[in-house]
């Protein structure tokens, strides 16, 4: 069964720039991917990024760039105002869902903190199902 | 642009076997999977499997386990099919599609004919 | 097995509003997304894609073409039928293990 992982790379010469690369381990489908954050733009849960292996990337500020890295990996680059950056990232969580084939979906979430440089390798993070 | 050539039509005798091919080219081969549908006369569409040709990973719909046989040369970005112990059955037209779980691109079809 | 099940045909005037609908037996929606897909097939030629995840269309495809719906129920509407739409229709979910189509609907002109 899949497992999704998280990481979130914050660029070292530009605080207002980051970067969220998620994707999936073991084998399967991948029929879209959606990166998604919560507390970072508002209380709610912002959609940053809807990404189709066939038919394209949508985005949505403050996404500014989403691609795939790999068939099994996207990445999605972010960037706001130096301020409201460093003001908001501590309660920001990133989620990447994963909708596979014949697994279902898998979630995965990581909450990025001052003191968190982010995952320097792809390990699970929090992972949710819904099959 | 995304093409999917697939080989000639076949006439087979019930109990052979056939190899129906499927050369893909104007996309990353690798990033993929290769499905084969089956349609048969009555327009009915049948999934028969897929292969991913990355990983060499297949998955099979159960009915056609035994029957259908997926295969993949990167070198040459083609896809096959092998079809065994034939039936009248199996006569149909057979297609490649490239995609994830949606079919984006299709192959022209392959006509397979079983009969004695 | 998913079953999708499709009215066999439906006749319609140039010009005019064509609804062709597809029940699926068990819900295709997962998540927010509804995985289900829309393939036309002329007479002769290979399916191609209409629609995918239920009303996403992909690029190059008429704007005539839409589709709707969500659960068991959805829905392909071409608006306004032209002479070049006469073909089969087919639905297509990918929810499930194994992938399975409808059984097609045949657009014919009245």
């Known amino acids: 069964s899949p497992e999704v992982w998280v990481q979130v790379q914050m660029e070292a010469t530009n605080l207002s720039s980051f970067s969220v690369h998620c994707g999936v381990l073991g084998y399967s489908l991948i029929s879209l991917v959606t990166v998604s954050c919560e507390g970072f733009v508002d209380a709610g849960r912002t959609k940053l990024a809807v990404l189709h292996p066939e038919f394209g990337t949508q985005q949505w500020a403050p996404a500014r760039q989403a691609h795939w890295e790999t068939p099994n990996s996207v990445s999605v680059t972010l960037t706001m105002g130096q301020s409201k950056a460093r003001s908001s990232l501590a309660n920001t969580t990133f989620c990447c869902e994963f909708v596979t084939f014949p697994h279902g979906s898998r979630v995965a979430c990581r909450d990025l903190h001052r003191s968190d440089p982010g995952l320097s390798a792809p390990t699970p993070a929090l992972n949710l199902q819904a099959d | 642009q995304v093409q999917l050539q697939q080989s000639g039509a076949e006439l087979a005798k019930p109990g052979s076997s056939v190899m129906i091919s499927c050369k893909a080219s104007?996309?990353?081969?690798?990033?993929?999977?290769v499905h084969w549908i089956k349609q048969t006369t009555g327009q009915a569409l049948e999934w028969t499997g897929y292969?991913?040709?990355?990983?060499?990973?297949?998955k099979y719909n159960e009915k056609f386990k035994g029957k259908a046989t997926l295969t993949v040369d990167k070198s040459s970005t083609t896809a096959y099919m092998q079809l065994s112990s034939l039936t009248p059955v199996d006569t149909a037209v057979y297609y490649c599609?490239?995609?994830?779980?949606?079919?984006?691109?299709w192959g022209q079809g392959t006509l397979v004919t079983v009969s004695s | 097995d998913i079953v999708l099940t499709q009215s066999p045909a439906l006749a319609v005037s140039l010009g005019q509003r064509a609804t062709i609908s597809c029940r699926a037996s068990?819900?295709?929606?997962?998540?927010?997304?509804?995985?289900m897909q829309w393939y036309q097939q002329k007479p002769g030629q290979e399916p191609k894609i209409l629609i995918y995840?239920?009303?996403n269309l992909p690029s190059g495809i008429p704007a005539r073409f839409s589709g709707s719906g969500s659960g068991t129920d959805f829905t392909l509407t071409i608006d306004p039928v032209q002479a070049d739409d006469i073909a089969t229709y087919y639905c297509?979910?990918?929810?499930?293990?194994?992938?399975?189509f409808g059984s097609g609907t045949k657009l014919e002109i009245k």
């Open positions: 068990q819900s295709v929606s997962l998540s927010s997304y509804n995985l």
């Open positions: 599609a490239s995609g994830t779980t949606r079919f984006a691109y």
């Open positions: 292969i991913a040709p990355g990983s060499g990973v297949t």
């Open positions: 104007g996309y990353t081969f690798t990033n993929y999977a």
């Open positions: 995840d239920a009303s």
């Open positions: 297509q979910q990918s929810k499930d293990d194994p992938l399975t």
